[in-house]
Interface confidence: low
């Protein structure tokens, strides 16, 4: 660092004073020198280092008429909003000819009420769930002791005898406020007050109680909610989409979910208007007066197959001699599953009903063996899934057979390249 020589007397007639104050203080350091001839530029040092960007002003006043007479030079360094980084030893420095001169030092100190580097933040926590709060303060002067308060009540008997920077709270059953006090030799500073809102715990073991083709009955175990009773639970269901894929922790579904509210208790809900034989993902959250719990993870569920809701359509039954040709179209009503086939029943007025499984074909030829006359022959068709048969169609009549045919209808089905099925 530059040092003044002892060859000549120091030009400084006024040295920087001392400043001690709290953060944010504004102050000024001043030094004064008297020199002969052209006044030099005054530099400021902090802890021996030149301050390149100092907020300083220099005033020069001649003491005589001539340039070679003496000059009084005053330099002022302004410190705005005092911070810890401003503290240290300050000196003025001048270059005069081949010599360097520095003033006597002055000191800038920071001393006041504690200053918070970290304060507790507002947050929500689940009831009876541990969490931590943080608080950090500094001087000078040191040391700084912290005292935590819950709902304005101290959690220790005196500063320094309780938890310091981090407060571990084992759990809350009601919404509470927390703050910390920082104590030092200058006094006490109180942090902001953080509100810790107690929400219900996430519901547990969301599960299916029963399945129907268009509804799922689900149940769950509610989490603790502290002193606040649960007002309702909200269940969301979304169609599973293998393309999108709902991840266990994904916060939002890929599409608008079906949302239902359940009064509680009981912690059970019948979720209706679903598609049969369809995978869904469901989740639940429960709400108290303080707000909602977090959602459970998405649970994959599936509605079972149902039976078709309607009969086959456009059934026509015509005959040509001893053959009856029956054809139909797939039900317009929802199938509620995978169509496995059709069942056909036919019956004459005085003959037993004959039941056939046609498979997935939509037509069949009945080989009516013998020349019997059968009156009022009717045909019904039903579609079926793995869950069972759908409703039968209304009976469709065949036109009356020619008179003179004596044998009753009792044997059936013949299609090219397939054997005939016969009923005794």
């Amino acid at each position: 660092a530059p040092r003044g020589t002892q060859a000549e007397e120091s030009p400084f007639v006024g040295n920087p004073g001392n400043i001690t104050g709290a953060r944010g203080l504004t102050g000024t350091l001043r030094c004064q020198l008297q020199v002969q001839g052209e006044p030099p530029e005054v530099h400021w040092l902090r802890d021996g280092q030149i301050l390149e960007l100092a907020d300083s002003t220099q005033t020069q006043v001649p003491l005589g008429e001539d340039e070679q007479d003496d000059w009084i030079v005053v330099s002022q360094l302004r410190i705005t909003s005092l911070q810890l980084s401003d503290t240290g030893q300050y000196q003025c420095l001048v270059f005069l000819g081949h010599q360097t001169f520095v003033s006597q030092p002055g000191y800038v100190g920071l001393e006041g009420l504690p200053y918070f580097l970290e304060e507790p933040e507002d947050r929500t926590v689940a009831a009876n769930t541990p969490f931590n709060l943080s608080c950090q303060a500094q001087g000078p002067p040191e040391p700084v002791d912290l005292l935590w308060l819950q709902d304005a009540v101290p959690l220790a008997t005196a500063p320094g005898h309780g938890p310091q920077r981090s407060l571990h709270v084992p759990g809350l059953n009601k919404t509470s406020s927390f703050s910390c006090e920082a104590h030092n030799a200058k006094g006490v500073t109180t942090s902001r007050t953080a509100t810790i809102t107690v929400l219900p715990q996430q519901p547990r073991n969301l599960h299916l109680v029963s399945r129907q083709p268009t509804e799922l009955e689900v149940a769950w175990t509610p989490g603790l909610s502290g002193i606040y009773p649960l007002t309702h639970c909200t269940l969301q269901a979304v169609l599973s989409d293998d393309g999108m894929g709902i991840q266990a922790g994904e916060p939002d579904p890929p599409e608008e979910p079906l949302t239902s509210q359940a009064s509680v208790p009981p912690h059970q809900l019948r979720l209706g208007s679903l598609h049969p034989h369809t995978p869904y993902h469901i989740r639940v959250a429960c709400t108290s007066s303080q707000g909602p719990s977090s959602w459970t993870h998405w649970l994959p569920v599936e509605t079972p197959e149902g039976v078709p809701l309607g009969p086959p359509e456009n059934i026509s039954a015509t005959r040509n001699g001893s053959q009856a040709f029956v054809h139909w179209q797939e039900p317009r009503a929802p199938l509620q599953g995978t169509l496995l086939g059709y069942r056909l029943a036919y019956q004459g007025q005085d003959t037993p009903e004959v039941l056939m499984d046609i498979g997935l074909r939509q037509e069949v030829t009945l080989e009516l063996q013998g020349d019997g006359s059968v009156s009022n022959l009717t045909v019904c068709v039903a579609a079926y899934t793995a869950a069972g048969d759908g409703p039968w169609s209304l009976p469709v009549p065949l036109e009356a057979w020619r008179p003179g045919q004596a044998q009753p209808v009792h044997q059936l089905v013949k299609e090219p390249s397939t054997p005939a099925f016969s009923w005794p």
Epitope: L208, E302, P304
Partner: antibody, heavy 118, light 107 residues
Framework: DVQLQESGPDLVKPSQSLSLTCTVT?????????WHWIRQFPGNKLEWMGY???????NYNPSLKSRISITRDTSKNQFFLQLSSVTTEDTATYYC???????????WGQGTSVTVSS | DVQITQSPSYLAASPGETITIKCRAS??????LAWYQEKPGKTNKLLIY???TLHSGIPSRFSGSGSGTDFTLTISSLEPEDFAMYYC?????????FGGGTKLEIK
């Protein structure tokens, strides 16, 4: 390996309560799974009685709901069956088992035979 | 409650043969049917769940099929250790219910 072992009295008098213990080794009953009681009557008919879930919630067969209670002692890794007001119809071999939600029971105990008789 | 009807109640077969056991539910239980094997002195063994999913460690000669109300357990190429009691159980809804059992004996 997970093992379940039932224990309790061989003989219970009618109108008394039947108490059985299932001791689980090799897995904590608070970690996962549902923990069930099933019984098998003479003639081999099996009846599911109920379970206690790892969270502590329970579910019972409606046919037994007024008489059954399933509890646990997590420190001993045991769960219990209590059946009150027993009759001779409750004579059976009692099994404990575990399962995941809506999946079948993958571990069973050996079973313990209980006779209700005066 | 869902009633489960299991058939046959008794079945005699020879090692190497293939056998089938059937269970019928009183209403649709989707695919949620399990099969167990019971042998004296041993703990009950889960063979198949969800109709057709083979439980870990179970030989592939055991297979399950069916959905809705009708289900089948097939054991192909019977081994001597397969002669035992077999039960089906629906795990679609509570209360869980079981079939009456099938006793498979050596012919």
């Amino acid at each position: 390996d997970v093992q379940l072992q039932e224990s309790g009295p061989d003989l219970v008098k009618p109108s008394q309560s039947l108490s059985l213990t299932c001791t689980v080794t090799g897995y904590s009953i608070t970690s996962a799974y549902s923990w069930h009681w099933i019984r098998q009557f003479p003639g081999n008919k099996l009846e599911w009685m109920g379970y206690i879930h790892y969270s502590g919630s329970t579910n019972y067969n409606p046919s037994l709901k007024s008489r059954i209670s399933i509890t646990r002692d997590t420190s001993k890794n045991q769960f219990f069956l209590q059946l009150s007001s027993v009759t001779t119809e409750d004579t059976a071999t009692y099994y404990c088992a575990r399962s995941l939600w809506f999946y079948a029971m993958d571990y069973w105990g050996q079973g313990t035979s209980v006779t209700v008789s005066s | 409650d869902v009633q489960i009807t299991q058939s046959p109640s008794y079945l005699a077969a020879s090692p190497g043969e293939t056998i089938t056991i059937k269970c019928r539910a009183s209403k649709s239980i989707s695919k949620y049917l399990a099969w167990y094997q019971e042998k004296p002195g041993k703990t009950n063994k889960l063979l198949i769940y969800s109709g057709s999913t083979l439980h870990s460690g179970i030989p592939s000669r055991f297979s399950g099929s069916g959905s809705g109300t009708d289900f089948t357990l097939t054991i192909s190429s019977l081994e001597p250790e397969d002669f035992a009691m077999y039960y089906c159980q629906q795990h679609n809804e509570y209360p869980w219910t079981f079939g009456g059992g099938t006793k498979l004996e050596i012919k």
